[in-house]
């Protein structure tokens, strides 16, 4: 572990500061981590990391002159599970062929860059659950259809918050098993079109806080368990509750919206077919009793990723066999915002 210009320890290489003007061609191919921090790299050239068969992590951070990432930079790296590209405000272009064949990828971060389009992830083909973390890229305005096809054969978490997203096309999430979608803090985002989740499974968690979204799509929310819409002042109405059959937790803007969940009963037709099997009824009742108050989904500040992808909700949820739905909703109605004002006693009864 020795290099003329990069620091290293135990096969981790740190290429740091202004003396680093290009990716050194003589970095040992058995490196397990590469970090490029505060450098003067302008271009990351095609094939810069080819042959790094043991490479697990790449970090490219605080590189203020970086402009371009060429094709085949992150390609054919069998052990690579983490890529971080952050604080590169002059990074305007990532070649569509930059990310290819990364079977172990679990985390891809692109934040605080100048890119205008989402990176092309169609050829990543990860065999792992992937967290795609694309934040603080104020020049990304659109999410095109099929934007995440080919990212992973497993489920994905998409953190797309704090970008400049203004428009999301129908079928944007086609082909994904969407565990979590975070669109918060895209202040100019006004619409989630009706078919935005067409071809997708999920989302299970959806965060649209601090956007201008005025309505949720009519389709694709069947698996939604947790909805966050804090400070989403344009969201004046929710879909009919029949569209939110799995919802268990809602964190909303207006207390009045929580009134909708008071004494909500699922129609028998909405229950999962397994619930009708009489052999299972006793077991289901016992299990739901024993579990009592279910463990809450990921805390607001804790991602499913940080808990090691402990996605318990992918198993069958016997609570869905309860007719009475206990949705945890906030902000709760109170003396100043009583449900009676908007719903009336008759409906509540």
């Amino acid at each position: 572990c020795h290099h003329r210009i990069c620091h290293c320890s135990n096969r981790v290489f740190l290429c740091q500061e202004s003396k680093v003007t290009e990716i050194p061609s003589d970095l040992p191919r058995n490196a397990i981590e590469l970090r490029f921090v505060l450098t003067k790299l302008r271009v990351i050239q095609k094939g810069a990391f080819s042959g790094f068969g043991d490479l697990e992590k790449i970090e490219i951070s605080q590189n203020d002159v970086l402009e371009v990432i060429e094709a085949d930079v992150f390609s054919n790296l069998p052990k690579l599970h983490e890529i971080r590209i952050e604080k590169a405000n002059n990074l305007l272009y990532i070649n569509p062929e930059a990310f290819q064949n990364l079977p172990n990828l679990q985390y891809l971060l692109i934040s605080n860059t100048g890119i205008k389009h989402l990176p092309d992830v169609h050829k990543i083909h990860s065999l792992q659950k992937v967290l795609l973390d694309i934040q603080d890229n104020i020049n990304i305005h659109t999410i095109e259809r099929n934007s995440f096809v080919g990212l992973s054969f497993e489920s994905v978490i998409l953190w797309l918050n704090k970008n400049g997203i203004q428009e999301i096309h129908n079928c944007a999430f086609n082909g994904t098993q969407l565990d979590e979608l975070n669109l918060s803090d895209n202040n100019n985002l006004e619409e989630l079109p009706n078919d935005v989740f067409h071809g997708a499974s999920g989302p299970v968690i959806l965060d649209i806080s601090r956007t201008r979204i005025h309505s949720l799509p009519s389709y694709g929310l069947e698996n939604l368990k947790k909805l966050r819409a804090r400070s989403t002042y344009n969201l004046k109405k929710l879909p009919t509750l029949e569209k939110l059959v799995a919802l268990m937790e809602a964190s909303l803007t207006y207390p009045s919206h929580c009134c909708a969940f008071a004494n909500w009963r699922r129609q028998i037709s909405e229950l999962h077919p397994i619930c009708n099997k009489s052999i299972l009824r006793q077991e289901v009742d016992y299990m739901t009793q024993a579990r009592g108050q279910r463990s809450s989904l990921a805390e607001d500040n804790e991602s499913s990723y940080s808990r090691g992808f402990d996605m318990t909700y992918t198993e069958f949820d016997y609570d869905l066999c309860n007719e009475v739905v206990d949705v945890t909703c906030s902000p709760k109605p109170d003396a100043f915002n009583p449900c009676e004002d908007i719903m009336g006693y008759n409906i509540l009864r």
Epitope: C1, H2, H3, R4, I5, C6, H7, C8, S9, N10, V12, L14, Q16, K19, E33, R35, V37, E59
Partner: antibody, heavy 120, light 111 residues
């Protein structure tokens, strides 16, 4: 085979200027990643880093002595120079020239040192 | 400045036994996952010689009985098994930030 050799006056009077020369072989200060520095050690005491210079002429000084230090190089003749102005008795020490690798800032090879005595 | 404090100041170890020297930094010497902490050996009348760099990486040609460990602010140098030739002064040194500084040294002798 890397070799470094220090040369200096041996004895100086207080307030005089110390001029040290490091002559080296086995590497070039024109090669990226290479640096040469100076470290001193008073007899029977610890080590003090003074200054170093990189291949690209980037220089770093110990802030406690910066106002008195000047480091320079002549890459073509494989030499590095250190000037210490206004010496005092506390500058009495063995002065080592060191080859530094930018990777890990490693003090890879040391000269045998030259002794300076400051006495009136 | 980052102050490095070595302990003990001196140490007597039997041949074949383990010598452990500690080096504590006044603040972390880690940067982006790498510890900028080196260990040197100095014998009387000779310049120091690099043994360990980046806390735990052995310089080529250094015997395997020398090993380093630690991160952040706490580091140690181990010599095992102790040999006659290992009688010397040992210094830790940080190069995380200028001014690069050295510990006060530990004198290791044979008991």
């Amino acid at each position: 085979q890397v070799n470094l050799k220090e040369s200096g006056p041996g004895i100086l009077q207080p307030s005089q200027t110390l001029n040290l020369t490091c002559s080296f072989s086995g590497f070039s200060l024109s090669t990226s990643g290479m640096g040469v520095g100076w470290i001193r050690q008073p007899s029977g005491k610890g080590l003090d880093w003074l200054a170093h210079i990189w291949w690209d002429d980037d220089k770093r000084y110990n802030p406690a002595l910066k106002s008195r230090l000047t480091i320079s190089k002549d890459a073509s003749s494989n030499q590095v120079f250190l000037k210490i102005a206004s010496v005092v008795t506390a500058d009495t020490a063995t002065y080592y020239c060191v080859q530094i690798n930018y990777g890990n800032y490693r003090f890879d090879n040391w000269g045998h040192g030259t002794t300076l005595t400051v006495s009136s | 400045d980052i102050v490095l404090t070595q302990s003990p100041a001196s140490l007597a170890v039997s041949l074949g036994q383990r010598a452990t020297i500690s080096c504590r930094a006044s603040e972390s010497v880690d940067n982006y996952g790498i510890s900028f902490l080196n260990w040197f050996q100095q014998k009387p009348g000779q310049p120091p010689k690099l043994l360990i760099y980046a806390a735990s990486n052995q310089r080529s040609g250094v015997p395997a009985r020398f090993s380093g460990s630690g991160s952040g602010t706490d580091f140690s140098l181990n010599i095992h098994p102790m040999e006659e030739d290992d009688t010397a002064m040992y210094f830790c040194q940080q190069s995380k930030e200028v001014p690069w500084t050295f510990g006060g040294g530990t004198k290791v002798e044979i008991k």
